[in-house]
């Protein structure tokens, strides 16, 4: 019971958290405009993965995708992948995973068989959170590199009358989607695997009885003896569990208004 | 098609208060932020804040903190400028104006004349 | 706040000619993200509410006469009128549509002789 519970909650976490990941790799606010040295700015620009938007004051947003893959930065493109590669291992997990999970009953699966599929989508699902918390890490740092170097640049060369802001980007709302989902599908995957543990059944060892018929000796071996290897049939009636989750819409969180006072 | 109609000339005096209004129509007024501008005779053009109708926001240049309050009602599509406190430095013509992509205003009213006079 | 100076302050022109008049911003008006100039310029004629020329510092409202162009970026902008007519007589005004407090510049008085 505790096996099921163990890998149904980790089913559930890794989906959570996958779905996660997809919101923060389709969203627009991966950065977004520093507003500290200029709170009172009638324009806002955020940038994400894909595209990069402008939002007036006026309420209009424009976003312009960026249609070039040679002249994007190579960081940018190494995010990029490492999300990608998230969201496939993630997505093939949850397969697996699905087939894996004890209350769902296919054929005559064996208990090992699923004990396999378990560890199998539980090491994806590690792997695809770590890729999440990767990228959005690698993503964070060039923000950081970035800002430090902008901030460098706004305080030197201001010596004549006309002062240049120069636009700075910070966190924007992505990146804390990604650490928390990434983070989800890991805690899912390492739940998998610890239900793995149990849903593997242990070997018993059975003495063999021999019997001795006329002519020849046959020995027997008792049926309830299973092999680890995952062979023997499994013939309880279980309950059958569509696994229909359902993901919640993304919802994109716009920086608040700073209004000039 | 699209206009701002706002309230007759004023003629008050000082120390009272004044509400001008400006009805909006031939659009979705609440989906648009509504300026005002102040023009004092023979001047140039002195931004005085924005209400966006749909929620109420509003930003106020400082130099009109506690001159001037902006308020707007959904039902009759009509934004006002209630000043207070007047002075014969509040005598202008006062323009209400839709904001629109560009930051820019692109449709104004007719204007309102208020002069303070005791 | 950012301070727009526009000169001339006024001109006279003869019909046909070409004008052009200037608005220097204190501050840049170019926003980074998409590359535009947070500049609009504004035609007021004698007894009449401004009316929108040209937002983005060069992109002319619709139904504005192809004779007016707008043009510039970062803090130097001009607004060049090809061919002036009698109706051009006006005050033209820029403003600042970057950064609040929204703020106009002083205006330049155009004269036909």
């Known amino acids: 019971m505790a096996v099921t519970a163990c890998q149904g909650l980790g089913f559930v976490v890794s989906l959570i958290g996958i779905a996660g990941i997809i919101a923060a790799t389709c969203m627009d606010q991966w950065s977004t405009q520093d507003l500290y040295n200029n709170p009172v700015t009638a324009v806002f620009n955020y940038q994400g993965l894909w595209r990069s938007c402008v939002r007036e004051s006026s309420g209009f947003t424009e976003c312009r995708g960026y249609f070039t893959l040679l002249g994007l930065p190579a960081m940018l493109q190494a995010v990029r992948a490492l999300m990608i590669v998230g969201i496939v291992l993630g997505a093939i997990g949850l397969l697996v995973s699905i087939f894996a999970l004890k209350c769902i009953r296919i054929g005559s699966m064996e208990d090992s068989a699923k004990a396999n599929m378990t560890l199998t989508s539980g090491i994806m699902f590690i792997v695809s959170g770590l890729c999440a918390i990767a990228g959005v890490s690698v993503f964070a740092n060039m923000l950081v590199t970035n800002f430090w170097m902008s901030t460098a640049n706004m305080y030197t060369g201001m010596g004549g009358m006309v002062q240049t802001v120069q636009t700075r980007y910070t966190f924007g709302a992505a990146l804390f989607v990604g650490w928390v989902a990434g983070g989800l599908t890991l805690i899912g995957g390492v739940m998998m695997c610890i239900a793995c543990r149990g849903l593997a059944p242990e070997e018993t060892n059975y003495k063999a009885v021999s019997y001795h018929a006329s002519g020849h000796s046959v020995a027997y071996k008792p049926g309830g003896f299973k092999a680890s290897t995952g062979f023997g049939s499994n013939t309880k009636n279980k309950k059958i569990y569509d696994g229909g989750a359902r993901t919640e819409d993304e919802v994109q969180s716009y920086p608040s208004k700073h209004d000039y006072v | 098609q699209l206009q701002l109609q706002q309230s007759g000339t004023e003629l008050v005096r000082p120390g009272s208060s004044v509400k001008i209004s400006c009805k909006a129509s031939?659009?979705?007024?609440?989906?648009?932020?509504m300026n005002w501008v102040k023009q004092r005779p023979g001047q140039g053009l002195e931004w005085i804040g924005q209400?966006?109708?749909?929620?109420?926001?509003?930003k106020y240049n400082g130099n009109f903190k506690g001159k001037a309050t902006l308020t707007a009602d959904k039902s009759s599509s009509t934004a006002y400028m209630q000043l207070s406190s007047l002075t014969s430095e509040d005598s202008a013509d006062y323009f209400c104006?839709?904001?629109?992509?560009?930051?820019?205003?692109?449709?104004w009213g007719q204007g309102t004349t208020l002069t303070v006079s005791s | 706040d950012i301070v727009l100076t526009q000169s001339p302050s006024s001109l006279t022109v003869t019909a046909g000619e070409k004008v052009t008049m200037s608005c220097k911003s204190s501050q840049s008006l170019l926003n980074s993200g998409n590359q535009k100039n947070y500049l609009t310029w504004y035609q007021q004629k004698p007894g009449q509410p401004p009316k929108l020329l040209i937002y983005w510092a060069s992109t002319r409202d619709s139904g504005v006469p192809a004779r007016f162009t707008g043009s510039g970026s970062g803090t130097d902008f001009t607004l060049t009128i090809n061919s002036v007519q009698a109706e051009d007589l006006a005050v033209y005004y820029c403003?600042?549509?970057?950064?609040?407090?929204?703020?106009f510049g002083a205006g330049t008085k155009l004269e036909i002789k």
């Open positions: 403003q600042n549509a970057y950064t609040y407090p929204l703020t």
């Open positions: 104006a839709r904001y629109y992509r560009g930051n820019c205003f692109d449709y």
């Open positions: 209400i966006y109708p749909g929620n109420g926001d509003t």
């Open positions: 031939g659009y979705a007024f609440s989906n648009y932020w």
